[in-house]
């Protein structure tokens, strides 16, 4: 079942997926100037069995201008290099070092695609924030959302995750709030 | 369930201070952050601040910056709002709400601010 | 500071009726944006977050639509207990802010 709605929108955060339940999709989008092949599917579907999950169908993008010649599939270093993400907080990186059965990791980047992909979450599939490069988190409780069937119809719990800009954080004495990388995630994932 | 239970009606002079409570139950209290909000006497609502229940790390509405303290205590799972140099103008029914969408409101501190 | 302007100030409306009550945000502010209501002597209570979603418990008559600046609050058939005031209110950044209210009375 497709999640209806985007997870929520946190100010100065951005959200990220460690893994990615059977039934996600994901949207084959290419850059400016480059277009699907016309073959190509349009989005890629993580399929599995009861031992192992992986991507269905491959994205692949061509120059708008040329024709008949497809784009090598494999990423060249400085493309995987932008695309790397940072850990969001250790229940992530715990989870991004065990494969969870029934979910697909982050799929490698694909040559010219979009810099934002597009996900159609499935119910169950949790997503975590993170406040932005030059934000801090005033207040971390929960930062994570999860997408639930509740009366028929989905919708994503609410991450209690407020990120601030204003400096002097007037703490208990000595006590320090867990911090977040210090990066943000390159791009917020979208869904639709 | 979910409930916040705040501290009884106040009458205070003008000049003097004020500090009211707001008791959270029913769930994870560290895990949402808690707003301060007041109405005066028929008018609309007015946020105050908001205060992290986890850290202590607070911010302010400028109008009350300064005059405005909101302090929590983990172990009793209670929010706390200080007001000082009250005024007549500070006379308002104030609450506690819950977390970023405001999902949980306390019943409310009717402050009486009269010389 | 965003404010937020609600309209109309009050209406009065027969039970059965659609309502419908606007705000504006003096710039935009996504879909970061609650309705309460408020019944006299009594704490306001969440009716939609997030712009659209539903709070746990409140009818399903009740719905909220909007993004960027403009945003609508509907109820699709008024019942008695439907009478109050009605508050927007954004949580796009500190300070947040509410709209001056909407008093909505049963003809």
């Known amino acids: 079942e497709l999640c209806d709605d985007d997870p929520p929108k946190i100010t100065h955060a951005t959200f990220k997926a460690v893994a990615y339940k059977e039934g996600t999709m994901l949207n084959c989008e290419c850059k400016r100037g480059f277009r699907r092949i016309k073959s190509g599917s349009p989005y890629m579907l993580c399929t599995g069995n009861s031992s192992h999950s992986s991507w269905d169908n491959q994205c692949q993008c061509t120059s708008s201008a040329a024709r008949n010649t497809t784009k090598q599939v494999t990423p060249q270093p400085e493309e995987q290099k932008e695309r790397k993400t940072t850990e969001m907080q250790s229940q992530m990186q715990l989870a991004d070092q065990v494969s969870l059965p029934g979910h697909c990791r982050e799929p490698p980047p694909w040559e010219n695609e979009a810099t934002e992909r597009i996900y159609h979450f499935v119910v169950g599939q949790t997503v975590y924030y993170q406040c932005v490069q030059g934000y801090r988190a005033l207040h971390r409780g929960p930062a994570e959302s999860v997408c639930k069937m509740t009366h028929g119809k989905t919708r994503w719990t609410q991450p209690q995750l407020i990120c601030t800009g204003e400096t002097e954080p007037s703490q208990f004495p000595g006590e320090e709030e867990p911090q977040a990388s210090p990066d943000g995630l390159p791009e917020s994932e979208t869904s639709r | 369930q979910v409930q916040l239970v705040q501290s009884g009606a106040e009458v205070k002079k003008p000049g003097a201070s004020l500090k009211i409570s707001c008791k959270g139950s029913?769930?994870?209290?560290?895990?949402?952050?808690m707003h301060w909000v007041r109405q005066a006497p028929g008018q609309g609502l007015e946020w105050i601040g908001v205060i992290s229940t986890y850290s202590g790390d607070a911010i302010y509405a400028q109008k009350f910056q300064g005059r405005a303290t909101m302090t929590v205590d983990k172990s009793t799972s209670t929010a706390y709002l200080e007001l000082s140099s009250l005024r007549s103008e500070d006379t308002a029914v104030y609450y506690c709400?819950?977390?970023?969408?405001?999902?949980?409101w306390g019943q409310g501190t009717t402050v009486t601010v009269s010389s | 500071d965003i404010q937020m302007t609600q309209s109309p100030s009050s209406l009065s409306a027969s039970v059965g009726d659609r309502v419908t009550i606007t705000c504006r945000a003096s710039q935009d502010i996504s879909n970061y944006l609650e309705w309460y209501q408020q019944k006299p002597g009594k704490a306001p209570k969440l009716l939609v977050y997030n712009a659209k979603t539903l709070a746990e418990g409140v009818p399903s008559r009740f719905s909220g639509s909007g993004s960027g600046t403009d945003f609508t609050l509907t109820i699709s058939s008024l019942q008695p207990e439907d009478f109050g005031t009605y508050y927007c209110?954004?949580?796009?950044?500190?300070?947040?802010?509410f709209g001056q209210g909407t008093k909505l009375e049963i003809k």
């Open positions: 209110q954004h949580h796009y950044d500190t300070p947040y802010t």
């Open positions: 029913g769930y994870t209290f560290t895990d949402y952050a």
């Open positions: 709400a819950r977390g970023v969408t405001f999902d949980y």
